[in-house]
Interface confidence: low
């Protein structure tokens, strides 16, 4: 089955610059299929822009200004690129690549879409580092004791642009765990978001990862925030204990920045 | 030019209660086109649901039913038993791929219909309230309540900033919420919740611990012993900005 990946979750540009968006095709030979590009402007319908066929023929939607969009396919890396020249405010949109995928039953086809890349145009001069800054919260002892479960919370702050994806996995597993998240909120010129994961008691002794995808992550790779395992077998109801009384029976986590 | 027009901009649905989305075609006969349905979820993922004739995306056949009403020139998508996973924007789109003659392999989309999912009407449930802290950051976790109306207060005399709460449907079909804030006196912050004309405090749920660690350090990690017998393990946070974390119980 054909699968489309758009590695850039967002692409931030200043006016008049060139944006290059990538789409990686797997599960099907790019040289044997056509790749389509669609645009979804805020509040408008999703619109076909341009396609490139298996033989390299390019077809543009009527009404699209010539010279604005350039589409290419690179068989060597199974990649199609959409180049947007001289970006302007009206180019702000989410851009999707798509292809027709044949179903097992002869003659049946469906069009599958990539996850989209949001083109953001800014005139702001932002701080050098606008990657998401993580703060972690471990389960409260009360929750682990009373509910035989624990909630991890991953707070991400001071990032730009607002496009961010967060998911959770156990340390040595690729299975994505069911989590919940708040809306992305604006704070001054940057954004914040949080996501939380509730796990049953039997999973508390495993390490968990909050995995964050953002355009400005260092080196362009997903940021992994490790949540250490929790020991639950030591919790008692002894009122005389004063070890963590001053911290309201929660864990106080102090994050120290030791990067250069 | 043809246009696809959804019946509603927003459709609230209840978990388990069937719902129907409709999309009419203007300017052409719907029978001349193939109709497709897609769902866009948080994070912009566009997932294929249905295409004539009887083609369903993986995992959709059991819970979705696509149809065409040629007399009314409209497309219909039924969600047979909605769950919280079905929340998102639903799009109808048409093409003429494989119909012979002048055909278009591009999709023409209608505007989306936002489907919001609500829990089924059910007996009222009082929330559990827990506080989680890290430095000046405090989170109030409110679990498993119904109905949705709730007021969450983080009680502090030294507020730096507070954020609007996130309220979401829990996997069990009730609600969960989290409210975050930053406080100079985070150690003394508690959380109180007004729900269903009652007040619930985080302190109602506090338990005492013995003097052993709550976080299990790895074999290879160093642990320092503070004056009380509480472990202070080092945990590695794989991020570019934060790479050392000390835990104090």
């Amino acid at each position: 089955a054909g699968h489309l990946e758009q590695p850039q979750i967002s692409s931030t540009k200043t006016l008049s610059k060139t944006a290059r968006l990538e789409c990686v095709v797997s599960g099907i030979t790019i040289s044997a299929t056509s790749v389509y590009w669609y645009r979804e402007r805020p509040g408008e319908v999703i619109q076909f822009l341009v396609s490139i066929s298996y033989d390299g023929t390019v077809r543009k939607e009527s009404g699209i200004p010539s010279g604005k969009f350039e589409v290419d396919r690179i068989p060597e890396t199974s990649t199609s690129t959409l180049t947007i020249h001289n970006v302007e405010k009206q180019d702000i949109a989410t851009y999707y690549c798509a292809l027709w995928e044949a179903q097992q039953e002869l003659g049946k086809k469906i069009k599958v879409f990539g996850p989209g890349t949001k083109l953001i145009i800014t005139d702001k001069q932002l701080d050098a580092d606008v990657s998401p800054k993580p703060t972690i919260f471990l389960p409260s002892i009360a929750e682990t004791k009373l509910q035989k479960a624990g909630t991890y919370l991953c707070l991400l702050e001071k990032f730009f642009p607002d496009v961010i994806k967060i998911h959770w996995q156990e340390k040595k597993s690729n299975t994505i765990l069911g989590s919940q998240e708040g809306n992305t909120m604006k704070t001054n010129d940057t954004y914040m978001k949080f996501s939380w994961l509730t796990v049953p008691e039997k999973s508390l002794d495993k390490e968990h990862r909050c995995i964050v995808r953002h355009e400005n992550n260092k080196n362009g790779v997903d940021q992994e925030i490790i949540f250490p395992p929790i020991k639950t077998d030591v919790i008692t109801m002894d009122p005389k204990d004063n070890c963590s009384k001053d911290a309201n029976d929660t864990l106080l986590l102090q994050l120290t920045n030791t990067s250069a | 030019a043809i246009e696809l027009v959804p019946e509603h901009q927003t459709v609230p649905v209840s978990i388990g209660v069937p719902a129907t989305l409709r999309c009419s075609m203007k300017g052409e006969a719907i029978g001349n086109y193939y109709i497709n349905w897609y769902r866009k979820t948080q994070g912009n993922t566009m997932t294929f649901i249905y295409r004539e004739k009887d083609i369903y995306g993986p995992g959709f056949k059991d819970n979705f039913q696509g149809d065409i009403d040629i007399a009314k020139n409209l497309a219909v998508l039924k969600i047979l038993a909605p769950s919280e996973r079905d929340e998102g924007s639903y799009y109808c789109a048409c093409d003429t791929l494989g119909m012979g003659g002048e055909y278009t392999d591009k999709l023409i989309f209608g505007k989306g219909t936002r489907v919001t999912v609500e829990p089924r009407s059910q007996p009222h449930t009082k929330p559990s309230v827990f506080v989680m802290k890290n430095g000046t950051n405090v989170a109030c976790l409110v679990k498993e309540f119904y109905p949705k109306d709730i007021r969450i207060n983080l009680v502090s005399s030294k507020k730096i900033t507070e954020f609007d709460p996130a309220i979401v449907i829990s996997p069990s079909g009730k609600y969960n919420a989290v409210k975050l804030g930053k406080y100079e006196d985070s150690n003394s912050v508690t959380c109180s919740v007004q729900h269903d004309n009652k007040t619930v405090h985080s302190t109602d749920f506090e338990v005492k611990t013995d003097s052993t660690d709550h976080v299990k350090p790895k074999e290879t990690e160093n642990t320092k012993q503070p004056s009380k017998s509480c472990h202070k393990p080092k945990a590695i946070v794989h991020t570019e900005k934060v790479n050392m974390m000390s835990l104090t119980v």
Epitope: E76, N219, V221 | -
Partner: antibody, heavy 120, light 111 residues
């Protein structure tokens, strides 16, 4: 500038699995395809396969049943596993970056290679 | 057996022009770009020509590439003794779901 360094055992027994790692330094593994290529002594180059930083792979059909290429973005490295090896798998193994944009799929940066001998 | 065909050896005297040819099929050279690599004994190959005729920075303009139909060639003008090396052509092959294919290599000797 970006440099590649192969590492792994120089001797593997027949029928066992050959495992090599390629560490990318001086740049990010992100947004590129990364390949493994081998060269038996005195012979030409043979392409083994590539991986995209997100995990998508493509393998040489003649080796597909025995090859696994994995990527670890957090460690900025990718790896090769070749199972059920025989003496015919004795070769210098190179890792290489597949160029983007105008470099259109050329292997633009290579590791220095590591010799692997299959012998009991 | 290499998918692309190269003559096993070529030779020339300093200052001469030498051409190395590479022949393929419609599914590789015919529909994709050709790259050339230079390899000295005991070292890793180095990219010499990409996209049929483009030189990476640092490669002297004595080296040029061309492609016609299902064949490609590498020309070296003003041959120098340091050009003595093995030269490989490479392309991608659509019929094999885009794997890389190499020629068998041409050993260039400067007499």
């Amino acid at each position: 500038q970006v440099q590649l360094q192969e590492s792994g055992p120089g001797l593997v027994k027949p029928s066992e699995t050959l495992s090599l790692t390629c560490t990318v330094s001086g740049g990010s593994i992100s947004s590129y395809f990364w390949s493994w290529i081998r060269q038996p002594p005195g012979k030409g180059l043979e392409w083994i396969g590539y991986i995209f930083y997100s995990g998508s792979t493509n393998y040489n059909p003649s080796l597909k049943s025995r090859v696994t290429i994995l990527v670890d973005t957090s460690k900025n490295h990718f790896s090769l596993k070749l199972s059920s090896v025989t003496a015919a798998d004795t070769a210098v193994y190179y890792c290489a970056r597949v160029g983007r944009w105008e470099l259109r799929g050329a292997f633009d940066i290579w590791g220095q290679g590591t010799m692997v001998t299959v012998s009991s | 057996q290499p998918v692309l065909t190269q003559s096993s050896s070529a030779s020339g005297t300093p200052g001469q022009r030498v051409t190395i040819s590479c022949s393929g099929s419609s599914s590789n050279i015919g529909s994709n770009t050709v790259n050339w690599y230079q390899q000295f004994p005991g070292t890793a190959p180095k990219l010499l020509i990409y996209s049929n005729n483009q030189r990476p920075s640092g490669v002297p303009d004595r080296f040029s590439g061309s492609k016609s139909g299902t064949s490609a060639s590498l020309a070296i003008s003003g041959l120098q003794s340091e050009d003595e090396a093995e030269y490989y052509c490479a392309a991608w092959d659509d019929s094999l779901n885009s794997p890389g294919v190499f020629g068998g290599g041409t050993k260039l000797t400067v007499l």
